[in-house]
Every structure is written in structure tokens, then in C-alpha cells.
């Protein structure tokens, strides 16, 4: 159960003070500090766990990835988990801590010295999410190590959105991921389905920009479920 996962980490993964990053083991549930308004807007760390639900890695912090807290867990229960350090097992790049990537199921350093321009990319993923399965097929894609020094511009190959410049996100394009523009008002968006895997999204769109959400276009309400058009609209 979720509680047993939380409790099993109760001693070794106490949250750090003031929201600082901590060296969690990869399986730890994120213990996130919050802001307590009654006490004068001060940060307060809380010693019990605060699971943070997510559907994709982008909803989590830079030192986290999104996954089920238990092996083979319910697809509808995914939370932000602490990233995996070097030499830890992985299934996709986002599982590895910044400065590392997933190669042959292990987190390895992406430093220039170690990086050889080859990344293993697992492509069998949930619809709109970045949750690979162990039986995924692997493709190889070439990536310039230069991207680790400057923020990627539109079309640059990336591993995660933090590799991309402001206003861009890292999204799948064929078998690799590239920096694409965050969607603007009126642009067509992908409404992520509630539960379960719905195949591979080969051309992944970015999320809607700030103050926008992905909703059914007004004049498409009568259309059938499969043909409904979603666009980025003001809240």
C-alpha cells in the first residue's frame, strides 16, 4: 500500500530544511516542504510524507521523476519520486538525477568526459506520459554534448525540459526528444487521458502556457469522443 511505502522510508528520508535538495535513495517518496501562511508565510518542514501526485515528469521537481510508488502499481496512482543517482537502475532518462542519463538500464554521467553522443531511448510509453516499461523497445539517437552547456533552442535534442530555453519544453519527436514551443492560446493541445496506457505518442506536444489549460473547443462539444478538438484556453 502507499502508506507502507511511505512508512518504510520514514527514518532515512526525512525532508531537508527549507526546501533544500536532499540525497534520497531512488525509491523514496518526495517529502516536500510547504509554506504555512498562518505563521507569517514561513517555510515549514513536516516530518511525515507528502506524496505529490503527477502524470508526467514535468510536474515534479528537477530532482524527481513521476512513477508509481510500488512495482506494477495502479496507473492512477503516480507520485513524484526522488531521482536515481549514478550507477542506479533506470528505465528512462528522467529517472536519473540531473547530470546523468539512462544508458542500458543504468544511470550514467552525462559529463563531457563520459558522454559519447549515444543515448538509449526507451520508446514504448504511456500516452502523453513519460512512463516507460521494462519491455520497451530501444532506439539510439545522437545527441551533442554541447546541450549541457547552453539551453537548447527550438529543435535542439533534449532529455528534459530544463535542457530547453525559456518558453520551450522537451517533447518527443519520432524516436528522440527535442525542444518545442510551449503552446499558446488557441493552439491545439493533447488532453491526457485519465488512466492507463494508450500507446505511443510519436509527436508529443508541449503543455499549454501559463494561465492556459487544455479544454474542448466550444464548437466541438457535439462531436464524438474520438474527434473532439482540444485547444489551450484561458482559465
Amino acid at each position: 500500500t502507499l502508506n507502507s511505502v511511505l512508512n518504510s522510508n520514514a527514518i532515512k528520508n526525512l525532508p531537508p530544511p527549507l526546501g533544500g535538495a536532499a540525497g534520497h535513495p531512488g525509491s523514496a517518496v518526495s517529502a516536500a516542504p510547504g509554506i504555512l501562511y498562518p505563521g507569517g508565510n514561513k517555510y515549514q518542514t513536516i516530518d511525515n510524507y507528502q506524496p505529490y501526485p503527477c502524470a508526467e515528469d514535468e510536474e515534479c521537481g528537477t530532482d524527481e521523476y513521476c512513477a508509481s510508488p510500488t512495482r506494477g502499481g495502479d496507473a492512477g496512482v503516480q507520485i513524484c519520486l526522488a531521482c536515481r543517482k549514478r550507477r542506479k537502475r533506470c528505465m528512462r532518462h528522467a529517472m536519473c538525477c540531473p547530470g546523468n542519463y539512462c544508458k542500458n538500464g543504468i544511470c550514467v554521467s552525462s559529463d563531457q568526459n563520459h558522454f559519447r553522443g549515444e543515448i538509449e531511448e526507451t520508446i514504448t510509453e504511456s500516452f502523453g506520459n513519460d512512463h516507460s516499461t521494462l519491455d520497451g523497445y530501444s532506439r539510439r539517437t545522437t545527441l551533442s554534448s554541447k546541450m549541457y552547456h547552453t539551453k537548447g533552442q527550438e529543435g535542439s535534442v533534449c532529455l528534459r525540459s530544463s535542457d530547453c530555453a525559456s518558453g520551450l519544453c522537451c517533447a518527443r519527436h519520432f524516436w528522440s526528444k527535442i525542444c518545442k514551443p510551449v503552446l499558446k492560446e488557441g493552439q491545439v493541445c493533447t488532453k491526457h487521458r485519465r488512466k492507463g496506457s494508450h500507446g505511443l505518442e510519436i509527436f508529443q506536444r508541449c503543455y499549454c502556457g501559463e494561465g492556459l489549460s487544455c479544454r474542448i473547443q466550444k464548437d466541438h462539444h457535439q462531436a464524438s469522443n474520438s474527434s473532439r478538438l482540444h485547444t489551450c484556453q484561458r482559465h
Epitope: G20, Q50, R193
Partner: nanobody
Framework: EVQLVESGGGLVQPGGSLRLSCAAS????????MGWFRQAPGKEREFVAA????????VYADSVKGRFTISADNSKNTAYLQMNSLKPEDTAVYYC?????????????????WGQGTLVTVSS
């Protein structure tokens, strides 16, 4: 800054139901979760339930699973907690929490902002 206002708390008999609401304002980040936590007298604050921004992932504490349902209305920036089959041990101050996972804002870890809390008393 984020402001969270809870409502719907009150006195209810065991077996009864309540629906808590949480209105959030000042949320500027693109992707957020909303959650509920509670603190009983003399106890630590504990996690109750949370839902991610798209509704694709919901998480519940074992103690409320099957009895409580969390939902959210993105267009209104409002979260709800439907509490059924209430027990005396559910008596607590219930806090709404708005999360900022915010990878695109460079946060190393997802985190929550807290509301002031609303009291729920389950007693006959």
C-alpha cells in the same frame, strides 16, 4: 502569493458526509497538484489525499481510501474533498494544499503551499 481558502467544515454525526471546498488564487505556475492534509489535536499533520493538475493521478491515505474522494475544477482553481462514512477519528483541522511541482521553475522538489484550515468534528 498563493492564497487558499477552505470551506465546508463543521459538526457531523458518525456515518455522515461533508464536502470540503478549497478556492485557490494567485496560482501562477503551469502545472500544480491540489491536496488535503489534516491535523488532529495533539497529533502531527498527516496526508489525506491529492490530485494532479489533469486529474490523471489521485493519491489517498489508506485510512480514507474508499470513503473520501478528491476532485478539482481547474477552470475555477478549486479543489474538493467529498468525505463519506465519517468516523470520530476523522475529527481534525483539514488543510488545503496547492502544490508547485514546477520543474520549469527550477524547483528541485515538488512542494505545497498551505491554507488556514477548516475544522471537521465527527461526534454524536
Amino acid at each position: 502569493e498563493v492564497q487558499l481558502v477552505e470551506s465546508g467544515g463543521g459538526l457531523v454525526q458518525p456515518g455522515g458526509s461533508l464536502r470540503l471546498s478549497c478556492a485557490a488564487s494567485g496560482i501562477t505556475f503551469k502545472r500544480y497538484a491540489m491536496g488535503w492534509f489534516r491535523q488532529a489535536p495533539g497529533k502531527e499533520r498527516e496526508f489525506v489525499a491529492a490530485i494532479n493538475w489533469s486529474g490523471a493521478s489521485t493519491v489517498y491515505a489508506d485510512s480514507v481510501k474508499g470513503r473520501f474522494t478528491i476532485s478539482a475544477d481547474n477552470s475555477k482553481n478549486t479543489a474538493y474533498l467529498q468525505m463519506n462514512s465519517l468516523k470520530p477519528e476523522d475529527t481534525a483541522v483539514y488543510y488545503c494544499a496547492a502544490g508547485n511541482g514546477g520543474r520549469q521553475y527550477g524547483h528541485s522538489r515538488a512542494r505545497y503551499d498551505w491554507g488556514q484550515g477548516t475544522l471537521v468534528t465527527v461526534s454524536s
